[in-house]
């Protein structure tokens, strides 16, 4: 089993090409079977957050030394391990390092951690689709359409945890237009940076633009919901796609109201006002806890409309993880 | 890419014979190397394999029978410790892996044991 | 150790009809399903067909399909030509603090 394990060539530390140390020699793991379980244990045990990707070793630069060797052929983790060295492991067979595992996770030390302070997407339909808001020294500036590209989109999706860029280069409504001072133009990102701040830019609130060249952007933001373990899609324990991560929903105040917005945005009808009791047969889950201390109205159309923690953010077990029962 | 087995002959029995396998193409730091034998009108049978990690797994009926090692970058040896009559068989030096699209097996080598 | 119980041992099929083989193994081998089949003709060595149970090899017609998962594995040979008559092998890849690999017993395919 590996000693020690370390993610290398990111742009941080959680993030990169899996490294494993066997007798105090490092190596690669193979991509065999790697999946989000995997990563989910190895982010966890790096303390770096919650998984939020598989991508493949060799994008990581430096590239795997040839002479180092990769160790291990396959790992297969439940996600619930606290260390990859607990989870199921197969010695190397036959492995070359274009095979190379990677892993990426949430980094939760970052500026992009789930709570990004810096950016901001305003006046659009939830917080994955809005005009880009950048704050500097406690004030919120809009940004210039100048010289704004699908680049800086991906930095300000991926920056907010909200997924892909999937539209850009579009400028406000009019009612959508800001009215803070206009931050910068001339906007230069690579695709890499961590944050927007990181960017090159023009200097700070020297520019010629006019708020209707106000940047909006639109991200994926790809939440969804989904019961499991029941008799059909419309009864179970309720679980939420997040940063696309499954994961559980604690039942802290969650009553009626909830079941109610759940129900309507399956297409399930009603809730059947589930029994305690009957909630607990569908078990316990696994993995992430994303929501705590849901609170709707009942009329929202979406859960993730309804008042919530910040994602991942609980008190919670998986003792608590809300089951919901709807009429079909 | 390509295999090749070399070194098969007729061997009395209790004679040690070491058949090479040749490969060109292939890093054997990656790629693992197994040996496979067929007797006349029988079979495929696994013998034992070299990992790219460099370490020798064998069937339990061949352990002690038959040792696999890397002799260079290159080659890498079958060696049939003691040899019976059962040994008679065409021996294949294969790269496979059932989880793997790339197969890749030589001709064979002819090796029989006879007094 | 891994053993590999293919059935049956020898099927006789006419061109255009559909072969089916069947290969049992003793323990699951793995997530991964670690199993592949390949085609033997006399005088030359084994040509691989499908990997990972269910995935064409290269260059394979699709005539020739694979599945299951666990310990049950199925090869099926539809719309047979005379050029599929051939002795087939199931092959499992197995991990238990070590590797070993493992052939069927095999299944003479005869074309009518």
């Known amino acids: 089993s590996p000693s020690g394990v370390r993610l290398v060539g990111g742009l941080h530390r959680c993030e990169g090409r899996v490294e494993v140390e066997q007798k105090g020699q490092w190596g690669t793991v193979c991509d065999d079977g790697w999946d989000i379980k995997d990563v989910a244990v190895l982010c966890r045990e790096l303390g770096c957050g919650a998984a939020s990707g598989t991508p493949s070793g060799i994008l990581y630069e430096p590239p795997a030394e040839k002479e180092q060797k990769v160790l291990i052929q396959s790992v297969s983790c439940t996600g619930t391990e606290d260390t990859l060295a607990q989870c199921e492991q197969e010695e190397v067979y036959d492995c070359s390092h274009d095979e190379d595992a990677g892993a990426s996770c949430e980094n939760p030390e970052s500026s992009f951690s789930p709570v990004p302070e810096g950016v901001r997407l305003a006046d659009g339909p939830g917080h994955c689709k809005g005009r880009v808001e950048v704050k500097h020294q406690n004030q919120w500036y809009t940004v210039c359409q100048t010289g704004w590209s699908l680049r800086a989109a991906k930095v300000v999706c991926r920056q907010l945890g909200c997924g892909r860029a999937v539209l850009t280069q579009k400028r406000c409504n009019k009612h959508a237009y800001g009215r803070k001072p206009i931050w910068l133009s001339q906007m230069s990102c690579s695709g890499r940076e961590a944050t927007l701040q990181d960017c090159p830019s023009g200097p700070w609130g020297k520019n010629t633009c006019n708020h209707d060249e106000d940047t909006w952007v639109e991200c994926e933001d790809p939440f969804d919901l989904r019961l499991v373990g029941g008799d059909n899609l419309c009864s179970g324990r309720l679980e939420v796609l997040h940063k696309g991560v499954w994961g559980s929903v604690c039942d802290d105040n969650w009553g009626e109201k909830e079941d109610q917005v759940v129900c309507k945005q399956l297409g399930c009808g009603k809730s059947l006002s589930p029994s305690f009791r009957d909630r607990k047969c569908y078990g316990p889950g696994v993995g992430r806890i994303w929501l705590d201390n849901v609170r709707c109205s009942g009329e929202e159309q979406s859960l993730e409309q309804c008042q919530h923690r910040f994602w991942g953010f609980h008190d919670c077990t998986h003792q608590e993880d809300v089951a919901v029962i709807c009429s079909g | 890419q390509s295999v090749e087995e070399s070194g098969g002959r007729l061997v009395t029995p209790g004679t040690p014979l070491t058949l090479t396998c040749t490969v060109s193409?292939?890093?054997?730091?990656?790629?693992?190397i197994n040996w496979v034998r067929q007797a006349p009108g029988k079979g495929l049978e696994w013998i034992g394999m070299?990992?790219?990690?460099?370490?020798t797994y064998y069937a339990s009926w061949a352990k002690g029978r038959f040792i696999i090692s890397r002799t260079s970058s290159t080659t890498v040896d079958l060696k049939m410790t003691s040899p019976t009559i059962e040994d008679t068989a065409t021996y294949f030096c294969?790269?496979?892996?059932?989880?793997?699209?790339?197969?890749?097996w030589g001709q064979g080598t002819l090796v029989t044991v006879s007094s | 150790e891994l053993d590999l119980t293919q059935t049956p041992s020898s099927v006789s099929a006419a061109v255009g009809g559909t072969v089916t083989i069947n290969c049992q193994s003793s323990?699951?081998?793995?997530?991964?399903?670690?199993l592949s089949w390949y085609q033997q003709k006399p005088g030359q060595p084994p040509k691989l067909l499908i990997y990972?149970?269910?995935a064409l090899a290269s260059g394979v017609s699709s005539r020739f399909s694979g599945s299951g998962s666990g310990t049950e594995f199925t090869l099926t040979i539809s719309d047979v030509q005379c050029d599929d008559a051939a002795t087939y092998y199931c092959?499992?890849?197995?991990?238990?603090?070590?590797?070993?690999?493992?052939f069927g017993g095999g299944t003479e395919v005869e074309i009518k």
């Open positions: 294969a790269r496979f892996f059932a989880g793997r699209s790339e197969s890749l």
């Open positions: 193409g292939i890093d054997l730091s990656n790629y693992a």
């Open positions: 323990q699951s081998v793995n997530k991964n399903n670690y």
């Open positions: 990972s149970a269910s």
């Open positions: 092959q499992g890849t197995y991990y238990d603090s070590g590797w070993y690999n493992a």
């Open positions: 070299i990992s790219s990690g460099d370490v």
